[in-house]
């Protein structure tokens, strides 16, 4: 999916008002020094696609991202607020209700939303130059 | 089952504001969005916004900005739709539908219409 | 502001006939298209989803096809309860819009 055409104000005020809250509580009890980033964007798009990437696709050690609170709330603002992004979802909420998973945090997960803290952040500041 | 009732019918008096209101049941309420549509006499279908509770938001078509306001109490599964500086071409069919913001992305239910006439 | 043109504007057709109603969208929208049943005095009901997905406790006479700007709705053998009002609509992007309507009559 191409994020190029979203409506970046309203998915950055969703995120700002409640997604960055629901970011905190998972995280909390972990320091923020703990993890080092290692993901990065460049711009607005991209930085959407890889925050789409983190929170719904499963990766080793962390399969159960997709049904927090955080990545609910994601994948409401890009359904709203992305044109034609419903669409690609149909089948793949299909396919999610199939393979559901018990909720599990672990380390890796833990990692992993602070990458997403992180991938957040900087969608919110385009301007800045990338270090 | 899942339920939208809404309101009854209002008459109102030109530059003055109308609520109509839509309780929803049979249903989680923050799965999805509550959208309202109008249907003026013999015409089509025109949505005017919507109140996502998920994200504890609104938006709105740019026609209706700054004379709807599109609200919800989640306590009570109820959204609310109020329109102010009524004037006669607001008479209408207002209706509420919901809409899924995390699966099914479309208007899938809807209230019975609130009939809402404009006249001096 | 994507604009959806619905025809015919009105269909004249006997029970047993079928329908074809047609919706063009001014860009292109993929499959975010939906059609929805309306009656004198009612609500709209939802009939199909994305261009061609049907909803339970909706008759199979049913079908929709189409993507890009294109979209059908097809009624295989009309009932007498189908005799209404067809909007399609797009939930591509906001602002979400409707089509203009065709009217299926008795001819």
């Known amino acids: 999916y191409d994020f190029t055409n979203c409506d970046f104000e309203k998915i950055k005020a969703a995120y700002l008002s409640t997604i960055s809250k629901d970011l905190i509580t998972y995280m909390s009890g972990t320091k923020s020094t703990e993890f080092n980033n290692t993901v990065s964007c460049s711009n607005r798009p991209h930085c959407l696609t890889e925050i789409q990437s983190l929170t719904f696709n499963p990766t080793a050690g962390c399969a159960s991202l997709a049904k927090e609170m955080f990545a609910m709330k994601t994948k409401a603002a890009l359904a709203i607020w992305c044109p034609g992004y419903s669409e690609t979802q149909i089948n793949a909420t299909q396919a999610m209700k199939k393979r559901r998973k018990r909720k599990v945090t672990t380390n890796k997960c833990l990692e992993q939303v602070s990458q997403l803290q992180g991938l957040w952040r900087r969608f919110n500041r385009p301007l800045l130059k990338q270090q | 089952q899942v339920q939208l009732v809404q309101s009854g019918d209002e008459v109102k008096k030109p530059g003055s504001s109308v609520k109509v209101s839509c309780k929803a049941s049979g249903y989680i309420f923050t799965d999805y969005a509550m959208h309202w549509v109008r249907q003026r006499p013999g015409q089509g279908l025109e949505w005017m916004g919507t109140?996502?509770?998920?994200?504890?938001?609104?938006d709105y078509n740019q026609n209706f900005k700054g004379r709807a306001t599109i609200t919800a109490d989640k306590s009570t599964s109820t959204a609310y739709m109020e329109l102010s500086s009524l004037r006669s071409e607001d008479t209408a069919v207002y209706y509420c539908?919901?809409?899924?913001?995390?699966?099914?992305?479309?208007?899938?239910?809807w209230g019975q219409g609130t009939s809402v006439t404009v006249s001096s | 502001e994507i604009v959806l043109t619905q025809s015919p504007g009105t269909l004249s057709l006997s029970p047993g006939e079928r329908a074809t109603l047609s919706c063009r969208a001014s860009?292109?929208?993929?499959?975010?298209v939906h059609w929805y049943q309306q009656k004198p005095g009612e609500a709209p009901r939802l009939l199909i989803y994305?261009?061609?997905q049907s909803i339970s406790g909706i008759p199979d006479r049913f079908s929709g096809s189409g993507s890009g700007t294109d979209f059908t709705l097809t009624i295989s053998r009309l009932e007498s309860e189908d005799f209404a009002v067809y909007y399609c609509q797009q939930t591509f992007s906001l602002p979400y819009t409707f089509g203009t309507g065709t009217k299926v009559e008795i001819k």
């Open positions: 539908a919901r809409m899924g913001v995390t699966h099914s992305y479309v208007m899938d239910a």
């Open positions: 109140f996502i509770p998920l994200l504890d938001t609104s």
């Open positions: 994305f261009a061609s």
């Open positions: 860009q292109p929208i993929s499959i975010s």
